[in-house]
């Protein structure tokens, strides 16, 4: 990341910024499909791409309420192999559904410190967050 | 989203938070792969997962110093059908490689704006931001 | 003030279906950042978290009995039903339900700050 | 699922005495809440996020740790603070709320 200077009142703090909580309405983050119930492992011919996938998906909810975005999705592989694209259920050996992990910024809520100790409300401390974004049919690894 | 409330010091703006850059370093973003110059349209038996994938895909910067996170990345296909797991290369008609859509909660750093107008440094404004994550070996969709 | 207060039936036979249900007052469950849960605790044993309901209606369960419970929401009456199926013996227990979302100036908590008295559950034949 | 293992399971003290009950998560965690609970009772919040008293809660009682280990210390023990103490920690995914086995504290 390229440096954002400090961008306080004369009264803040240095390396803390103002946030403004959107001046846009944002709505709750919602994945394709929250189909927590669907656990089987095949190819649909409609519906959301996590359940048309041959390497079908469902989605885990992820909350903290002192964490921005506070709800994340984790995708959870339905099958250890690819769904055959012939029958949409017969399992594949030759293909792995493995996950695609991602490192997302996040922010968590920390309390902040004045200079003589004392609180200053809350500040935001920026993190790197690993979630799995979906599962993704890949041929196995040829090891050399 | 639940209501995070205002957070200032008392010569503070409503609606306004303090936001401390990150206490811990924080290294910046890579994918998995930033293989921009291999566009074949094939499935390797090595690399990273978007190479390996039978609906491989390349990753395109996208790069805002306004932004936080200020570097995305896009996913864009490389077949439009999926890559036969039996060859690697030939691509299989039965099935789509299709973009996986989300959207991202991102920060654009904008001017904040004092009692009287004047510039009090700039806050953060939060907004959706559409990515593609990854392509997807679906079956195709049957109309009813 | 707050007060929540747990209800239901006192005695059940196995393989029935428990419905407690948390009447609470003080506060709104659709106050953004409120959730409610439920707790148990065996005769002499430890307390145990079940199931969680938020203001938004997202709902948490413990993993190993998800497939036993339902919590549910009437915001309007001020009421979380908690639904368990099939019950045993060893389902025998002192139900609590109890608020969270308490709002510090450093975040949020997820300590549940407020509970009802519980409501004991035998199940026996 | 993060398992808490609270140590010890019983513990002796008397009035006037130093009591710390310690709480182990099976991974690291960023906090860890403390509950008190009489005979008869429900439980009643001690600590909040660590080392923050709950409201009414004296001040002999604290809060410490972090990662995997975390302490409640009651620097000078009275007739009423003997009790069973409860750890107890939120894990955002799954959404999961856990409790320790608790620690029974009684009068030698």
């Known amino acids: 990341y390229s440096h954002w200077p400090s961008c306080c009142p004369s009264k803040g703090y240095p390396s803390e910024e103002l946030l403004r909580w959107s001046t846009v309405p944002v709505p709750p983050l919602k994945p394709a499909s929250l189909d927590f119930h669907s656990v089987s492992c095949r190819a649909s011919e409609d519906g959301p791409l996590n359940s048309r996938a041959i390497s079908p998906w469902r989605y885990e909810l992820d909350r903290d309420l002192n964490r921005l975005p506070q709800d994340l999705y984790h995708a959870r592989c339905l099958c250890p192999h690819c769904v055959s694209l012939q029958t949409g259920s017969h399992m594949d050996p030759r293909g792995n559904s493995e996950l695609l992990y991602h490192n997302q910024t996040v922010f968590y809520r920390r309390p902040c410190h004045g200079k003589k100790g004392n609180h200053k409300g809350y500040c935001l401390e920026r993190r790197l967050y690993r979630v799995s974004l979906a599962c993704v049919c890949v041929r196995p690894r040829v090891m050399g | 989203y639940s209501h995070w409330p205002s957070c200032c010091p008392s010569k503070g703006y409503p609606s306004e938070e303090l936001l401390r850059w990150s206490t811990v370093p924080v290294p910046p973003l890579k994918p998995a792969s930033l293989d921009f110059h291999s566009v074949s349209c094939r499935a390797s038996e090595d690399g990273p997962l978007n190479s390996r994938a039978i609906s491989p895909w390349r990753y395109e910067l996208d790069r805002d110093l306004n932004r936080l996170p200020q570097d995305l990345y896009h996913a864009r296909c490389l077949c439009p059908h999926c890559v036969s797991l039996q060859t690697g290369s030939h691509m299989d008609p039965r099935g789509n490689s299709e973009l996986l859509y989300h959207n991202q909660t991102v920060f654009y750093r904008r001017p904040c704006h004092g009692k009287k107008g004047n510039h009090k440094g700039y806050c953060l404004e939060r907004r959706l931001y559409r990515v593609s994550l990854a392509c997807v070996c679906v079956r195709p969709r049957v109309m009813g | 003030q707050v007060t929540l207060r747990e209800s239901g039936p006192a005695l059940l036979k196995p393989t029935q279906t428990l419905t407690l249900t948390c009447t609470f007052s003080?506060?709104?469950?659709?106050?953004?950042?409120?959730?409610l849960g439920w707790i148990r605790q065996p005769p002499g044993k430890a307390l145990e978290w079940l199931a969680h309901i938020w203001w938004d209606d997202v709902k948490h369960y413990k993993p190993a009995l998800k497939s036993r419970l339902t919590i549910s929401k009437d915001t309007s009456k001020n009421q979380v039903v908690l639904t368990i199926t099939n019950v045993d013996p060893v389902d025998t227990a002192t139900y609590y339900c109890?608020?969270?979302?308490?709002?510090?100036?450093?975040?949020?908590?997820?300590?549940?700050?407020?509970w009802g008295q519980g409501t004991l559950v035998t199940v026996s034949s | 699922e993060i398992v808490l293992t609270q140590s010890p399971a019983t513990l002796s003290a008397s009035p006037g005495e130093r009591v710390t009950i310690s709480c182990s998560a099976s991974?690291?965690?960023?906090?860890m809440y403390w509950y008190q609970q009489k005979p008869g009772q429900a439980p009643r919040p001690l600590i909040y996020r660590t080392s923050n008293l709950a409201s009414g809660v004296p001040a002999r009682f604290s809060g410490s740790g972090s990662g995997t280990d975390y302490t409640l210390t009651i620097s000078s023990m009275e007739p009423e603070d003997f009790a069973t103490y409860y750890c107890q920690l939120y894990h955002s995914y799954p959404p999961t709320w856990t409790f320790g086995q608790g620690t029974k504290l009684e009068i030698k």
């Open positions: 991974s690291s965690v960023s906090y």
């Open positions: 109890a608020r969270m979302g308490q709002l510090h100036y450093y975040g949020y908590d997820y300590a549940m700050d407020y």
């Open positions: 003080g506060f709104s469950l659709s106050t953004s950042g409120m959730g």
